[in-house]
Amino acid sequence: TRDVREPPALKYGIVLDAGSSHTSMFIYKWPADKENDTGIVGQHSSCDVPGGGISSYADNPSGASQSLVGCLEQALQDVPKERHAGTPLYLGATAGMRLLNLTNPEASTSVLMAVTHTLTQYPFDFRGARILSGQEEGVFGWVTANYLLENFIKYGWVGRWFRPRKGTLGAMDLGGASTQITFETTSPAEDRASEVQLHLYGQHYRVYTHSFLCYGRDQVLQRLLASALQTHGFHPCWPRGFSTQVLLGDVYQSPCTMAQRPQNFNSSARVSLSGSSDPHLCRDLVSGLFSFSSCPFSRCSFNGVFQPPVAGNFVAFSAFFYTVDFLRTSMGLPVATLQQLEAAAVNVCNQTWAQLQARVPGQRARLADYCAGAMFVQQLLSRGYGFDERAFGGVIFQKKAADTAVGWALGYMLNLTNLIPADPPGLRKGTDFS
């Protein structure tokens, strides 16, 4: 006989990422004896909640909680039974609920209460359902990316922890209702609301972060539609041959399109609108989303928001990734430079509906949105955030790192479960050959 070492016990954590268009559940795991190590927490499994985001259940809060049941039942299977009681469960809602909270705080509260009621019925250690601020969403996305890529600290072969010389990565997240940019900066922010000080593994990080509400993909598309209805009898970003009927109430119900709402509009009126495949007019329409007219600081990104110059490498995830991946994979277009990204956007915007459908078989209606989406991503990065060709070369578009989805959820859990200590880790026991 010989001694067989038992695998280390695993701990688990669950985060429900309640986005504006849908909810995703992430289950994370880590060895119980290495809780304070870096790069140790990874994704165990995930589950996409069917239906829309929880904010879409404003008129039916119980529907929001009911929608989560399938994934929660999966969690019961995915997490070993003996670990259920010790597994923290969090729900974080983002910009969809921030918007609902602005327009209908009572409905927002009701949805969170209904969801809380359901989550407490499960044997996990439920630790709350809340709406994240834009700043939290940005910072936790940055923490996730850098944690997964082991940019905070590494364990050296001589048995010592050290800070990698490569520095941290900036993070850019494009959600359904908001977009976030977060990166480490050396100088203090001129706008204190955009600065976060972090202490991780004994290191100090000064981080710039800003979240632009109403600049998520879905809300941008809705704002462009409102603009097209206002200024054209057609939609320049939609493909020629794409024909819709629009209920005005559906366009103007969002607080993001409130400014474009006609004074006396009939919410039940229907308008027919077709696409025109016009890249130049589409570019003009997208440009109208950004204002560069005033800046109360030494420099701004857009809409008078302070932003230091982008520095270092960046990871762009969520809808940034999906948009660029569509251009690269479905359309077969190069997007390695800003110039190529712009050319790819123009290429998609030139396609007719029949051409697009032939290129990407199946009647996927969201195909009609890729022109506007690509044009927006290109303009947001170049004109909005100020990436030039050199800086753009340092942007990677990624969905996962170390088999774990890049997003705010992991960073949120790491923070709330104290899996990233503020103090430096002690030396490991072992042989030092020096």
């Epitope: 985001g53 041959g241 209920l247 009647q363």
Partner: antibody, heavy 124, light 111 residues
Framework: DIQLQESGPGLVKPSQSLSLTCSVT?????????WNWIRQFPGNKLEWMGY???????NYNPSLKNRISITRDTSKNQFFLKLSSVTTEDTATYYC?????????????????WGQGTSVTVSS | DTVLTQSPASLAVSLGQRATISCKAS??????????MNWYQQKPGQPPKLLIY???NLESGIPARFSGSGSGTDFTLNIHPVEEEDAATYYC?????????FGGGTKLEIK
């Protein structure tokens, strides 16, 4: 109000071609929408056959691709179905319908305007 | 092609009661958090008429006693309270991918 009306022979011989016309009133077929043909078999099963879009592009059901042709005459505001090499299996009620993408944060293809249908029997 | 299977093939419901019709898809008809499922009503001698789009959105002019729910592969049409004029055949239809396909229909009879 948009109205559609099918017309054509009620009886077609096997191996021949079936030709039907859909006349549209109340809306120009070049202004927007997709102009579909759908058929309903004797057992009530519905099958989408294809469409011609407002700008003249076609989209056909792959199961009929080699036999179907949908064309239009914009001056008469009509669109047509031609189905070749028919068999008794093509006996059905044929409907023309106007469709479009209904917006609601995404786009949902619906067929909202229908003709009354015309019955076609394939028999020798 | 996406095959849609409706059940039951027919049902008889008393006036004022609830009618529930199920539609099961051979593959998910969801994309990007949206469900591409429509419901149509067809009365004898008439063409189909759109009732519900996007799984749960009521077409304008359709009474609120009609409601749709579901996502992924499982969808339901509910009618409550059932009225005399609701006697018809009901079809589900997916538009997530080409070609659009219809379910086999459910015939509703009022007792």
């Amino acid at each position: 109000d948009i109205q559609l009306q099918e017309s054509g022979p009620g009886l077609v011989k096997p191996s021949q071609s079936l030709s039907l016309t859909c006349s549209v009133t109340g809306y120009s077929i070049t202004s927007g929408y997709y102009w579909n043909w759908i058929r309903q078999f004797p057992g009530n099963k519905l099958e989408w056959m294809g469409y011609i879009s407002y700008d003249g592009d076609n989209n056909y059901n792959p199961s009929l691709k080699n036999r179907i042709s949908i064309t239009r005459d914009t001056s008469k505001n009509q669109f047509f179905l031609k189905l070749s090499s028919v068999t008794t299996e093509d006996t059905a009620t044929y409907y023309c319908a106007g469709g479009y993408y209904r917006y609601g944060l995404s786009y949902y293809y619906v067929m909202d305007y229908w003709g009354q249908g015309t019955s076609v029997t394939v028999s020798s | 092609d996406t095959v849609l299977t409706q059940s039951p093939a027919s049902l008889a419901v008393s006036l004022g009661q609830r009618a529930t019709i199920s539609c099961k898809a051979s593959q998910s008809v969801d994309y990007d958090g949206n469900s591409y499922m429509n419901w149509y009503q067809q009365k004898p001698g008439q063409p189909p008429k759109l009732l519900i789009y996007a799984a749960s959105n009521l077409e304008s002019g359709i009474p609120a006693r009609f409601s749709g729910s579901g996502s992924g592969t499982d969808f339901t049409l509910n009618i409550h309270p059932v009225e005399e004029e609701d006697a018809a055949t009901y079809y589900c239809q997916q538009s997530n991918e080409d070609p659009p396909t219809f379910g086999g229909g459910t015939k509703l009879e009022i007792k």
